[in-house]
Each structure stands twice: as structure tokens, then as C-alpha cells.
């Protein structure tokens, strides 16, 4: 995009090409060669019909946000540079962007910066074989949060696994009784526990240990257990199904998950 024969401009808009994953922040820098007494700085996106759609503006030391609050303009301390950021970029934010300055009287005129291109790519999920870890290039705030949540989940799952193994192995060793029914369903939600935040991992396929003694017939063991992990503070939502031997790494929340973790 940024051809070498582009004319000199009192406005620059960089980088000329920017690629981010969806959910990440995309930040351009609009720089003025100098600051006139009075000016308005606008941030535009080029529409498919080559029209400029205004996203946000800066005027008289005041930020004027557009309709979509995800588009933010921040003046940097040197006064000539402005960060123009898309918070939690979406796939359809891909396109051509530029900034424009309107210099007010006595010498009213308009300057437009060179164009820059934003590409928002789909978030790449980690392959199932990898250990749970946050995807790369998460923002600092989210990184700590995701690591914490992941650690808690892994701990809880390990505890569940240990509890289940103990409950499954010891009664069988002592009494030889069949415990493959639903009597020992772990962490069953009580009727008075609402409201709860339910992260339902659904079907967890635990592999039976080879050394576990065969239960007496006619009790054929099922290969499936169900686990519901309960957190206080949010109503239950439909969960994902996952195998215990191939649990996905914890993913950061998508913007659709609500405003809790994403800046407005």
C-alpha cells in the first residue's frame, strides 16, 4: 500500500499494513508534522464505495467518540501523535483506514493521511495435543486472568479425577460392590444453589485403569462420567463436550461473552 512515490504529507498514518487476530486491539498512529492553532482530527474508514466514514474525532483537546465506542482516539504526550485503536477487533473491521486533519480559520483546509490497511484474521485455536495455555499475544490484563482461570480449572479437574478414582477403586476393593450407577455423581447441584455460573464440560471420557479389578457381572462398567463445575455468580449456560484425555486449553472470552473482561 505505501508506495515509494507517495507524496509528502503533513499527516502520516502507520503502520501501512496491520494484521491482528480477532479479539485483539488494533492500533494505528496518526502523526501531524506540526500542530496548528485550531484543528479537528478525524479518523476514517474507507467504505466499499470509496467514501470516508468517520469513526471518531479529536477537537479542542477533546475526544469525540463515534457511534461505536470500540473506536478510540488517544492524544500522546508530544501533542502531534495520536493513537487510533479498535478495541477487540472483529473480522469485519478489516479494511482501509486513514486520518484527516481539518485546519480551521484563518487558513481552512483539509489534509488526508496516506491510507493504511487492517487485516483481522480468525483466532487460531491451539491443537488438542498441547497443554492448556493461553493463546499468544493476549493483552496483559487478559493474560493473567486466563492463566489464573486455567490453573483453577486444571486443579479442580485433577481433584475431581482423584476423588472419582478413590471413590471408584476403594469400595470395589473392599466390598466388591458395583458402583457404576449414578449414586456417586460428583458435585451435584443442590436445588437451593441458584444463581450459579455453570461451566459444563459435559461428557468427560476417563480411561479406566488397567489394574482396576473387574467388577462382578452382571455389572458392566460404563466408560462415561458426567462432571459439572460450579462457580457462583452467573446463571447456567449450555456447556461444551470434551474428552478428559484431550481437553482444550482455556480460551479467552469472546466479546459476545459480555463486557466483563473486555474494555468498553
Amino acid at each position: 500500500l505505501d508506495s515509494p512515490d507517495r507524496p509528502w504529507s503533513p499527516l502520516t498514518f502507520s503502520p501501512a499494513q496491520l494484521t491482528v487476530q480477532e479479539g485483539e486491539n488494533a492500533t494505528f498512529t496518526c502523526s501531524l508534522a506540526d500542530i496548528p492553532d485550531s484543528f479537528v482530527l478525524n479518523w476514517y474508514r474507507l467504505s466499499p464505495r470509496n467514501q470516508t466514514d468517520k469513526l471518531a474525532a479529536f477537537q479542542e483537546d477533546r475526544i469525540e467518540p463515534g457511534r461505536d465506542r470500540r473506536f478510540r482516539v488517544t492524544r500522546l504526550p508530544n501533542g502531534r501523535d495520536f493513537h487510533m485503536s479498535i478495541v477487540a477487533a472483529r473480522l469485519n473491521d478489516s479494511g482501509i483506514y486513514l486520518c484527516g486533519a481539518i485546519y480551521l480559520p484563518p487558513n481552512t483546509q483539509i489534509n488526508e493521511s496516506p491510507r493504511a490497511e487492517l487485516s483481522v484474521t480468525e483466532r487460531t485455536l491451539e491443537p488438542p495435543t498441547q497443554s492448556p495455555s493461553p493463546p499468544p499475544r493476549l493483552s496483559g490484563q487478559l493474560q493473567g486472568l486466563v492463566i489464573g482461570v486455567t490453573s483453577v480449572l486444571v486443579g479442580v479437574l485433577l481433584l475431581l479425577l482423584l476423588t472419582w478414582v478413590l471413590a471408584a477403586v476403594f469400595p470395589r476393593a473392599t466390598r466388591g460392590a458395583c458402583v457404576c450407577g449414578s449414586e456417586d455423581e460428583p458435585l451435584k447441584e443442590g436445588p437451593d444453589a441458584a444463581p450459579v455460573f455453570t461451566l459444563d464440560y459435559g461428557e468427560l471420557d476417563f480411561q479406566w485403569r488397567e489394574k482396576t479389578p473387574e467388577p462382578p457381572a452382571p455389572c458392566a462398567p460404563e466408560q462415561t462420567e458426567y462432571a459439572t463445575i460450579v462457580f457462583p455468580g452467573r446463571p447456567a449456560s449450555p456447556g461444551r463436550r470434551a474428552s478428559a484425555s484431550s481437553l482444550q486449553g482455556a480460551q479467552p472470552p469472546s466479546p459476545e461473552d459480555g463486557p466483563g473482561l473486555w474494555p468498553l
Epitope: D5, P7, W8, A33, D34, I35, P36, N107
Partner: antibody
Framework: EVQLVETGGGLVQPGRSLKLSCVAS????????MSWTRQAPGKGLEWVAS????????YYPDSVKGRFTISRDNAQNTLYLQMNSLRSEDTATYFC?????????????WGPGTMVTVSS | DIVMTQTPSSQAVSAGEKVTMSCKSS????????????LAWYQRKPGQSPKLLIY???TRESGVPDRFIGSGSGTDFTLTISSVQAEDLAVYYC?????????FGSGTKLEIK
């Protein structure tokens, strides 16, 4: 009425320094971008230096870069050109020019010029 | 650097005649995104400082008589004086402001027969 008046020209020996001044009137000096342009005897016009309205950005051709410095005092409505390590090829009439179309470097107004002669 | 070449270096015409002078740039001065040509024309009369005539290749500066017409695009530009007057005796320069360093043509000297 826009007026630009250059002073400070004269005869100077090679290797020495000279400082030109340009006093502006008739317009809001601190809103506009300013330049120096010169014309050697019998030659064409040559751009020498440019400065933005508050002085934060300056521009020079390779022929004077590192030897000449453009600056401005907006309180005094004055533009300067500090010329060091002068050479005989710097002999010319120096014009102070204004770029009233903010951010585009064509020159709306020119001063009458001041003559600089570099000779031993 | 962008090199500006002006032709002819001088020409003599009679009052009332039409005159054209050429300015060529070593690279295009047309910026596709704003459709503007970054070219200006100046007039320098004997004993005077230069005066802006035309900018954006074809926009006349206020106060400039309409007999001065700028045209052209990309690398080839023309200044036309539709009916030369005695007071048009001068050297005419083109200048590109597309990029630094700013550069001028060597000038076309207009003489009146």
C-alpha cells in the same frame, strides 16, 4: 497586506558563518509554514530549508544539510537561517517564503531577498 | 530527487500572441488518492521577487489574470499565456512540491518582440 523582509546578507569569507533574519507581518505568523529559497547569479531557484509552524519539524536539501539551520521565533514574527561553513557556491540572493496553504510546500509570498556573497 | 526540466529556455513573442511553455518532471506528480498534481508555477519579473501564479498544476492564485492557464498531469505540464502583455516579460519557473527535496525547473525566459 502580507510582508516579508529579509536582513543579514553581506560579504563573508568561505568557512565563516552568517545569520539571516526575516520579519513577517500582515498574517498570523505562528499559523504558517516558512521556507528559505535562493537564487545564484544567472541560475535558477533552489530550495534551501523549510520549517513547520511551531518549529518542531525542519527540512533541508542535501546541499546544505548539517551546515544550515532554519528556526523561528513566533513571538517576534521572525524566521532565521543560520549558515555555517559557507562555500562560494552559497553565493545567492536568499528569499524568505511563506506556505500559507498549511502543509503544502508551494510559496504564496516571497520577500524581496537579501544578497549573500561568499568570497575570500 | 525529482528533476524538473523546462523548455524552451527562452522565447520571444509579440504582444497579443499566445505562448506556451513546458515543464516535465522525472516522476509523476499526480497522486492517485486525491487526484492532484503537486506542481506550481512562478513568475519572476526583472528586479522583483518571484510571484506565485498557479498551484495544483491548474489552480490560479487569487489576483492572477485569467490569461495565465496551467494544464497537464502526471509528468507533463504546460503554462499558457493566452494573450501576452508587455508586463508579462519575466522568467517563469515550475516547482514540484510532491516530495522533498523541493525542486524547481531552470526557468523559461519570456521576451517581448
Amino acid at each position: 497586506e502580507v510582508q516579508l523582509v529579509e536582513t543579514g546578507g553581506g560579504l563573508v569569507q568561505p568557512g565563516r558563518s552568517l545569520k539571516l533574519s526575516c520579519v513577517a507581518s500582515g498574517f498570523t505568523f505562528n499559523n504558517y509554514w516558512m521556507s528559505w529559497t535562493r537564487q545564484a547569479p544567472g541560475k535558477g531557484l533552489e530550495w534551501v530549508a523549510s520549517i513547520t509552524n511551531s518549529g518542531v519539524s525542519t527540512y533541508y536539501p542535501d546541499s546544505v544539510k548539517g551546515r544550515f539551520t532554519i528556526s523561528r521565533d513566533n513571538a517576534q514574527n521572525t524566521l532565521y537561517l543560520q549558515m555555517n561553513s559557507l562555500r562560494s557556491e552559497d553565493t545567492a540572493t536568499y528569499f524568505c517564503t511563506s506556505a500559507l496553504n498549511w502543509g503544502y510546500w508551494y510559496f504564496d509570498f516571497w520577500g524581496p531577498g537579501t544578497m549573500v556573497t561568499v568570497s575570500s | 530527487d525529482i528533476v524538473m526540466t523546462q523548455t524552451p529556455s527562452s522565447q520571444a513573442v509579440s504582444a497579443g500572441e499566445k505562448v506556451t511553455m513546458s515543464c516535465k518532471s522525472s516522476q509523476s506528480l499526480l497522486y492517485s488518492e486525491n487526484k492532484k498534481n503537486y506542481l506550481a508555477w512562478y513568475q519572476r519579473k526583472p528586479g522583483q521577487s518571484p510571484k506565485l501564479l498557479i498551484y495544483w498544476a491548474s489552480t490560479r492564485e487569487s489576483g492572477v489574470p485569467d490569461r495565465f492557464i496551467g494544464s497537464g498531469s502526471g509528468t507533463d505540464f504546460t503554462l499558457t499565456i493566452s494573450s501576452v502583455q508587455a508586463e508579462d516579460l519575466a522568467v517563469y519557473y515550475c516547482q514540484q512540491y510532491y516530495n522533498f527535496p523541493l525542486t524547481f525547473g531552470s526557468g523559461t525566459k519570456l521576451e517581448i518582440k
